[in-house]
């Protein structure tokens, strides 16, 4: 089966790599613009130069292209705790990330929020905090994991999932009490 190609891909595939079909004359292949530039005017004829101009401040193109406009630079979302790792250049978008001892949680493909890495108090670090994943904690006996924190089993209510984890501890306490009454 031949994969379905969009009009732009169809036009580009007629020309060799690094070139694109002239939109008004499909017998002409124009050279694409380098990254950091955009298409100002198509090449006037075969073997003639494409008129490419450098992206203005606040915009970029990260690969060779025949875009009529550069892409706007992304802004890091301060309200989500994001910080700028590297600023936008004509050939690279802004890179946003999190501070030290924080990780990214992606709410969607293009939206992340920075959260503090868990310290695993009353537990041990099973897996260290990574760029896109919080620390994985293992809780000490008498504690259970809730929202990635080790919480005392004394806070475990019967209706909660923690009953399975805390039950041996509760039985242990009862057993100790019983043995002390003889």
């Amino acid at each position: 089966l031949v994969p379905h190609l969009g009009d732009r891909e169809k036009r580009d595939s007629v020309c060799p790599q690094g070139k694109y079909i002239h939109p008004q004359n499909n017998s002409i292949c124009c050279t694409k613009c380098h990254k950091g530039t955009y298409l100002y005017n198509d090449c006037p004829g075969p073997g003639q130069d494409t008129d490419c101009r450098e992206c203005e401040s606040g915009s970029f193109t990260a690969s060779e292209n025949h875009l009529r406009h550069c892409l706007s630079c992304s802004k890091c979302r301060k309200e989500m705790g994001q910080v700028e790792i590297s600023s936008c250049t004509v050939d690279r978008d802004t890179v946003c990330g999190c501070r030290k001892n924080q990780y990214r949680h992606y709410w969607s493909e293009n939206l992340f929020q920075c959260f503090n890495c868990s310290l695993c108090l009353n537990g041990t670090v099973h897996l260290s905090c990574q760029e896109k994943q919080n620390t994985v904690c293992t809780c000490h006996a008498g504690f259970f994991l809730r929202e990635n924190e080790c919480v005392s089993c004394s806070n475990c209510k019967k209706s909660l999932e923690c009953t399975k984890l805390c039950l041996p501890q509760i039985e242990n306490v009862k057993g100790t009490e019983d043995s002390g009454t003889t």
Epitope: K78, E79, H105, W107, Q113, F115, N134, N148
Partner: nanobody, 119 residues
Framework: EVQLLESGGGLVQPGGSLRLSCAAS????????MVWVRQAPGKGLEWVSH????????YYADSVKGRFTISRDNSKNTLYLQMNSLRAEDTAVYYC????????????RGQGTLVTVSS
Amino acid sequence: EVQLLESGGGLVQPGGSLRLSCAASGFTFENKTMVWVRQAPGKGLEWVSHIDATGTITYYADSVKGRFTISRDNSKNTLYLQMNSLRAEDTAVYYCALLPKRGPWFDYRGQGTLVTVSS
């Protein structure tokens, strides 16, 4: 005690409009980034939109961009979501929430309001 109460949901035809409201109390509303999330039947929570404390910074999921508008009135402690050009896939329970701070879960969110888009 933090309280968030959504209203404005209902049945609407495709292409129609609705305006959701969220009345907030029990915290300093004007200091908080607020979020609209939704849950379609049988699906997980989807981040729809958020607005910063001052109302100057907004975000929209690609699925609602150009159709939904988030706003707030800090004098009334109320968050809004204007929904235009509604589609069947917008059918969901819509919740307003405070931006999570401790981790990726919602400590504070409302009970939700059901939006049904159907002809």
